[in-house]
């Protein structure tokens, strides 16, 4: 089996001239293409993979919403030579481009990483944007997280930062087959420089307060020790996606949008790929667009998510 091969990290890795063909290894009988698009109120970008896959032919489209960040995932697997170029990896263009000035800032200010490489989305390096409310939804929180797409034995990951509806979410996420959008939210100007180590704090559960030791007790060094023990005991892992349960009522819960999931013979990404041959695509300049007057994306193939702002 021969398949197209490319990796797109918000740049042009799967753009017209960058297509490769690879011969798949023995036992590989499907070509895969997967695209994940993320839309913030300040723009959108996509990650995509084409290559030799595993599983059975079929199609799976899914729309997801994480606190006002929209994610759209498409997977297509097929069993003919070079059949994996059916999905449109180009986001719908803007007309005119970037008219977010029409929106009234609501006072919140966040770092924005829309299609930026990890190198360009570090700390306070990325651009700062003014948040605004769109379609009756209030975007006053800031988000710091990642989008990850795994297909054809390749994992592509890009940082995501921007304005969201939630101000306290912690290691929250939405997933599709081989696709994850996850991260944390915060409140305050430019608070989303680095939320990787944020721990969950429910507004309904009072924080742990360290009382001063009795006056007859040992000096304050003990209190400092216990304080340091408490802080280091807090979990710092960023790999797992934790869904808050105790304070769910006070949060805007991440949910799948009302969108038909098309599953032709159950396409899935399980098992990875067994193909050889390198994949094209480099990091670098990012392709992204403002979503303030977008209608739908992607332009071709599968279900579409209506944009929230300005349509």
């Amino acid at each position: 089996l021969e398949c197209y091969s490319c990796v797109q990290k918000a740049d042009d890795g799967c753009s017209p001239h960058r297509m490769k063909t690879v011969k798949c290894g023995p036992g590989v009988d499907v070509c895969t293409e997967a695209v994940g698009a993320v839309e913030t109120i300040h723009g959108q970008f996509s990650v995509a993979v084409r290559g030799c896959g595993s599983g059975i032919p079929g199609k799976n489209d899914r729309g997801l919403d994480l606190h006002g960040l929209l994610a759209f995932f498409q997977l297509q697997q097929c069993s003919e030579d070079r059949c994996n170029a059916k999905l449109n990896l180009t986001l719908r263009g803007l007309n005119p481009a970037g008219n977010e000035s029409a929106y009234e800032p609501n006072g919140a200010e966040c770092y924005s990483c829309v299609g930026l490489s990890r190198e360009k989305c570090q700390g306070s390096m990325p651009p700062v944007v003014n948040c605004y409310n769109a379609s009756g939804r209030v975007y006053k929180g800031c988000f710091d997280g990642n989008v990850t797409l795994t297909a054809a034995n390749v994992t592509v990951s890009l940082p995501v930062r921007g304005c969201v509806q939630d101000e306290t979410c912690t290691r929250d996420g939405v997933t599709g087959p081989g696709f994850t959008l996850s991260g944390s939210c915060c409140q305050g100007p430019r608070c989303n420089a680095d939320l990787r180590n944020k721990t969950y704090f429910s507004p309904r559960i009072p924080p742990l307060v360290l009382l001063p030791p009795p006056t007859t007790a040992a000096p304050s060094t003990r209190a400092q020790n216990s304080s340091s023990t408490t802080s280091t005991a807090a979990p710092t892992t960023t790999t797992s996606i934790i869904k808050p349960t105790t304070a769910q009522a006070s949060h805007t819960s991440p949910h799948e949008m009302d969108l038909e999931v098309i599953q032709e013979e159950g396409a899935s990404l399980s098992g990875g790929a067994a193909g050889h041959g390198g994949t094209a695509g480099h990091g670098g300049a990012a392709g992204h667009q403002d979503r303030s007057n977008m209608e739908k994306y992607p332009g071709k193939g599968g279900a579409q998510i209506p944009a929230k702002g300005g349509s």
């Epitope: 091969s5 753009s15 001239h17 297509m19 063909t21 690879v22 180009t90 094209a280 670098g284 392709g287």
Partner: antibody, heavy 117, light 112 residues
Framework: EVQLLESGGGLVQPGGSLRLSCAAS????????MSWVRQAPGKGLEWVSY????????YYADSVKGRFTISRDNSKNTLYLQMNSLRAEDTAVYYC??????????WGQGTLVTVTS | QSVLTQPPSASGTPGQRVTISCTGS?????????VHWYQQLPGTAPKLLIY???KRPSGVPDRFSGSKSGTSASLAISGLRSEDEADYYC???????????FGGGTKLTVLG
Amino acid sequence: EVQLLESGGGLVQPGGSLRLSCAASGFTFSNAWMSWVRQAPGKGLEWVSYISSSGSTIYYADSVKGRFTISRDNSKNTLYLQMNSLRAEDTAVYYCAREGLWAFDYWGQGTLVTVTS
Amino acid sequence: QSVLTQPPSASGTPGQRVTISCTGSSSNIGAGYVVHWYQQLPGTAPKLLIYDNNKRPSGVPDRFSGSKSGTSASLAISGLRSEDEADYYCAAWDDRLKGPVFGGGTKLTVLG
């Protein structure tokens, strides 16, 4: 019908500047990757520059890097090439081309740029 | 000197089959990138003839065919006609130069 119409070519002295335009119609311009390709008199094709649909990914040939700037205005369906510090070897017919099906599937008729003293 | 190497000229008589070669390297054709062919009739802009190694855009006669193997590709024209007299260029992406590269072009002459 897809149409690409270049303009802005002409006679210019070495070290001078020119701005080429390419007006696109008959397709969704804001979805398309676009390129400039040039052809010196009696010579072969040479790719010059490449711009993504949104305008945020750009590549240049080494021969023009630092001197030429590609840009686009999706609201006007127009592609541009700003050419500064022009040299005699930049003399060529400049074509704008649309990328589709992994290739340049539509080309303009070209505009001639002549750099001479 | 062009990154992709083509013979400067080729010729044939009407009805004959002519093949034009295009040789690249491990950073372009050999890296797996697909090859395209363009036809440029005298005094006109180039036109896409073959894309993705061997596919024809609508309107291109099936007399034109493309193939690719290793670091080279070839364009075959069967049943040669006088209107096929033109310059033919191959093209592919190049990893090293980060852009599409063209062959130097092959001038096809239809004799007689």
